[in-house]
């Protein structure tokens, strides 16, 4: 058993049918010695008397808010949460496995640039009684500071018969140099509590590996005289690291017909313009990627050919 | 703002070209190592990230773009220990900081070159003959060093008398390639920046 925060304790349990559970001793936080009684949650049933209460915690029915009283007055509370271990592995019931980029990916993170700011998100089908707390650091032994905000519900989607909820959090490395070469990864730790269940999730990454630029901005077409060709031009996204001659992007320009089956023409360039043939009813899209370190491509920025 | 489309300085251009070749070569070599050594801890998540140039060169600090010198987090360990003359930039443009920067890059390349050559000698002794260093990568390191044209004492190749541990050597190769790829990215960024300045 360990303390998550004041008066909230996590009991770690091996979880299988007829498991013996854990013996827990609760102590009433009071100078009083006599006439103390204990109750669980909203029940008025007296579980025991005395300054300490010994309980065998086997299942969620044994968890909850234990309260000690004297003469109708509440003396103190202890909230017991359970952390399940099934076949030697901590449970991951609360969050959905996003399976991208690999199985057992519960937290996904992205950065728009090298400033040390990043966003992480996760998914759940649970709608109520859910709290998250996020901590982060650079490295684990002798950790350097990363400050994270509060996790917020950022999207709701209908998935078949169920609703899926997306939560996200923004974090900022306290002293980040965009040009630095990372040797220690960022660690992100999320504590999740649903009703009386505790779980924790972690992710470890280098900012350089989670870079995903915003789409190029000001995408424009300029028809070339007496030709089906157009000059496409665009600019670096505002959120990208500067100077751009140091933090350079490379671009992919795509001409896509109305039908998904039509052949796509693609051009790759380091410049912020390209000449392409504009077909009727087609659209031109441009996306960006770090020129020197192949992390994710941005989403597409698009304009119609007409 | 957009990348400048000014004509590259002829003095700088060969270095930019060589640095792009270097990044391509080290990325290819790293990919080959990851595939060949698939049952070894060779991915970014599995290896310890070591920098053999740590405390010996200061490329990131010496080559910091002017715009980032206002960022205090970038100035933690700014050292000014290399004063030499480089030929990558036309001499009229060679400022003190550029010389420090290019000299630091040269020292990095020299250190990695020695490490890679020593390692290759060990890998050639491996009866499994599982992996060797790509000669193209070694040649590209050499070409960039020549383009930088710094005078520096030659570092003798380390020779070892004891029997090599091939498992450890292959893991060390992975560590080295990951670190060198990161440094090659920095070198490419620097050359691109200097080329545009």
């Amino acid at each position: 058993i360990w303390e998550l925060k004041k008066d909230v304790y996590v009991v770690e349990l091996d979880w299988y049918p007829d498991a013996p559970g854990e013996m827990v001793v609760l102590t009433c936080d009071t100078p009083e010695e006599d006439g103390i009684t204990w109750t669980l949650d909203q029940s008025s049933e007296v579980l025991g008397s005395g300054k300490t209460l010994t309980i065998q915690v086997k299942e969620f029915g044994d968890a909850g808010q234990y309260t000690c009283h004297k003469g109708g007055e509440v003396l103190s509370h202890s909230l017991l949460l359970l952390h399940k271990k099934e076949d030697g592995i901590w449970s991951t019931d609360i969050l959905k496995d996003q399976k991208e980029p690999k199985n057992k990916t519960f937290l996904r993170c992205e950065a728009k640039n090298y400033s040390g700011r990043f966003t992480c998100w996760w998914l759940t089908t649970i709608s109520t009684d859910l709290t998250f707390s996020v901590k982060s650091s650079r490295g684990s032994s002798d950790p350097q500071g990363v400050t994270c905000g509060a996790a917020t519900l950022s999207a709701e989607r209908v998935r078949g018969d169920n609703k899926e909820y997306e939560y996200s959090v923004e974090c900022q490395e306290d002293s980040a140099c965009p040009a630095a070469e990372e040797s220690l990864p960022i660690e992100v730790m999320v504590d999740a509590v649903h009703k009386l269940k505790y779980e924790n999730y972690t992710s470890s990454f280098f900012i350089r590996d989670i870079i995903k630029p915003d789409p190029p901005k000001n995408l424009q077409l300029k028809p070339l005289k007496n030709s089906r060709q157009v000059e496409v031009s665009w600019e670096y996204p505002d959120t990208w690291s500067t100077p751009h001659s140091y933090f350079s992007l490379t671009f992919c320009v795509q001409v896509q017909g109305k039908s998904k089956r039509e052949k796509k023409d693609r051009v790759f360039t380091d410049k912020t313009s390209a000449t392409v043939i504009c077909r009727k009813n087609a659209s031109i899209s441009v996306r960006a990627q770090d020129r020197y370190y192949s992390s994710s491509w941005s989403e597409w920025a698009s304009v119609p050919c007409s | 703002r957009n990348l400048p489309v000014a004509t590259p300085d002829p003095g700088m251009f060969p270095c930019l070209h060589h640095s792009q070749n270097l990044l391509r070569a080290v990325s290819n070599m790293l990919q080959k190592a990851r595939q060949t050594l698939e049952f070894y801890p060779c991915t970014s998540e599995e290896i310890d990230h070591e920098d053999i140039t740590k405390d010996k060169t200061s490329t990131v600090e010496a080559c910091l773009p002017l715009e980032l010198t206002k960022n205090e987090s970038c100035l933690n360990s700014r050292e000014t220990s290399f004063i030499t003359n480089g030929s990558c930039l036309a001499s009229r443009k060679t400022s003190f900081m550029m010389a420090l920067c290019l000299s630091s890059i040269y020292e990095d390349l020299k250190m990695y070159q020695v490490e890679f050559k020593t390692m290759n000698a060990k890998l050639l002794m491996d009866p499994k003959r599982q992996i060797f260093l790509d000669q193209n990568m070694l040649a590209v390191i050499d070409e960039l060093m020549q383009a930088l044209n710094f005078n520096s004492e030659t570092v003798p190749q380390k020779s070892s008398l004891e029997e090599p541990d091939f498992y450890k050597t292959k893991i060390k190769l992975c560590i080295l390639l990951h670190a060198f790829r990161i440094r090659a990215v920095t070198i490419d960024r620097v050359m691109s920046y200097l080329n545009a300045s």
């Epitope: 029915g61 019931d93 649903h194 009703k195 009386l196 | -």
Partner: nanobody
Framework: EVQLVESGGGLVQAGDSLRLSCAAS????????MGWFRQAPGKERSFVAA????????GYAGSVKGRFTISRDGVENMVFLQMNSLVPEDTGVYYC?????????????????WGQGTQVTVSS
């Protein structure tokens, strides 16, 4: 709209059996734990039995252990309560309830969705 609909209640003699059913709709309950609670006239709603999401783990109130069996059909989104050797103290309105998140609880306050209830009367 999420709905839990109980059925199978009725008037029986002491010693008889009844099988209660609960049909769940409006969401997939395959990841939820399900439970049965009962409320006798003038008393608090109390825990009877519950089953986790996979059907592997079950829990019972002391007074019904060995007599009642809870089970579920995940495909059909159904939960059942087989009640044997009924006694007059088993009389009350039986409610089906669901809780998100795989594991069952004994406290009624932890359940997210409730049915309207079905009356069970056991006469002596």
């Amino acid at each position: 709209e999420v709905q839990l609909v109980e059925s199978g209640g009725g008037l029986v003699q002491a010693g008889d059996s009844l099988r209660l059913s609960c049909a769940a709709s409006g969401r997939s309950f395959s990841n939820d734990a399900m439970g049965w609670f009962r409320q006798a006239p003038g008393k608090e709603r109390s825990f009877v039995a519950a089953i986790n999401w996979s059907g592997e783990l079950t829990g019972y109130a002391g007074s019904v252990k060995g007599r009642f069996t809870i089970s579920r059909d995940g495909v059909e989104n159904m939960v059942f309560l087989q009640m044997n050797s009924l006694v007059p103290e088993d009389t009350g309105v039986y409610y089906c309830a669901a809780v998100e998140g795989r594991d069952y609880y004994r406290g009624a306050q932890y359940y997210d969705y409730w049915g309207q209830g079905t009356q069970v009367t056991v006469s002596s």
